[in-house]
Interface confidence: low
Amino acid sequence: YDFTNCDFEKIKAAYLSTISKDLITYMSGTKSTEFNNTVSCSNRPHCLTEIQSLTFNPTAGCASLAKEMFAMKTKAALAIWCPGYSETQINATQAMKKARKSKVTTNKCLEQVSQLQGLWRRFNRPLLKQQGSSDYKDDDDKHHHHHH
């Protein structure tokens, strides 16, 4: 799916209002410095591509994220604000239903969600090049100032 035509501001609002909090809840008890961010994205559609992949594609050592609250809300946001997204996810949904029902929070999953938090931050803070400025617009957690 090509995320070019999503309503990014609506997705951003969904993230700020609920998804971000669900990610924090999932990571509760984990130090923010515990994992290094190794996954990055260069623009909003690219960020959503990476977010979708990390959220819904099972990986070695972490097969159960799709059932988490933040994942379900992410899926809902993409389905609502990305034209045609729902249709492309029919097969993926069938596969998700076959996934293990038990939620096991492995260290690998925690690392993956830490990467997701970084991707979402990048998605929500595009550079605003106005009058020579290249500072990030800080809409969510103010203490992060990663320049890419």
Partner: antibody
């Protein structure tokens, strides 16, 4: 410095096709989207479509769907717009315009110089 | 498709006067961009994301609005400001308004 250099003017007969190129330089080609916009004489700007050089994904203005094809050659940092089944009302200046997602709202921050396409029998 | 309607189509004013250009969307959009175009030239980005001036645009220009109603304002017209201004949205694909020509009275 970001530059978009388009191919030269074209004169075509009705029913023919035209392929306009847009050579990008001064930035990483696959990091930005490329729009195609046209402007008939004395008329408004009309968005035709957009392509992601990163993955080749496209989205078209329904008005042109089936007639316009957007492609890229990543190795040459060049975007192409092909318009088929030309008619006289396709006479216009065709622009490529880079779309920079670093601005909220994804604005077209750099434009090519324009390619004049004249359709006449 | 979101339709953008600009008004007036032509604005005849003298240098030093205030210019107010309107852009209305057929349904709500997140942001509006504005471009300036002079005869024989490609459009130039003028105002990004409703209210952010593009590099080199003088401070006499400002942008505002939300939802379906957006405005570009020139506080005091200078000779170089006479041109056509287009609004553009991206919330649903991309569309341009019909343009407002600011001409010397």
């Amino acid at each position: 410095e970001v530059q978009l250099v388009q191919s030269g003017a074209e004169v075509k007969k009705p029913g023919a096709s035209v392929k306009v190129s847009c050579k990008a330089s001064g930035y990483t080609f696959t990091d930005d989207y490329m729009n195609w916009v046209r402007q008939a004489p004395g008329q408004r700007l009309e968005w035709m479509g957009i392509i992601s050089p990163y993955n080749g994904g496209t989205s078209y203005n329904q008005k042109f769907k089936g007639r316009v094809t957007l492609t890229v050659d990543k190795s040459a940092s060049t975007a192409y717009m092909e318009l088929s089944s030309l008619r006289s009302e396709d006479t216009a200046v065709y622009y490529c315009a880079r779309e920079d997602y670093d601005y909220d709202g994804y604005a077209m921050d750099h434009w090519g110089q324009g390619t004049t396409v004249t359709v006449s029998s | 498709e979101i339709v953008l309607t600009q008004s007036p189509a032509t604005l005849s004013l003298s240098p030093g006067e205030r210019a107010t250009l309107s852009c209305r969307a057929s349904s709500s959009v997140s942001y509006m961009h504005w471009y300036q175009q002079k005869p024989g030239q490609a459009p130039r980005p003028w105002i990004y994301a409703t209210s952010n001036l593009a590099s080199g645009v003088p401070a006499r220009f400002s942008g505002s609005g939300s939802g379906t109603s957006y405005t570009l304002t020139i506080s005091r017209l200078e000779p170089e400001d006479f041109a056509v201004y287009y609004c553009q949205q991206w919330s649903s694909n991309r569309t341009f308004g019909g343009g407002t020509k600011v001409e010397i009275k």
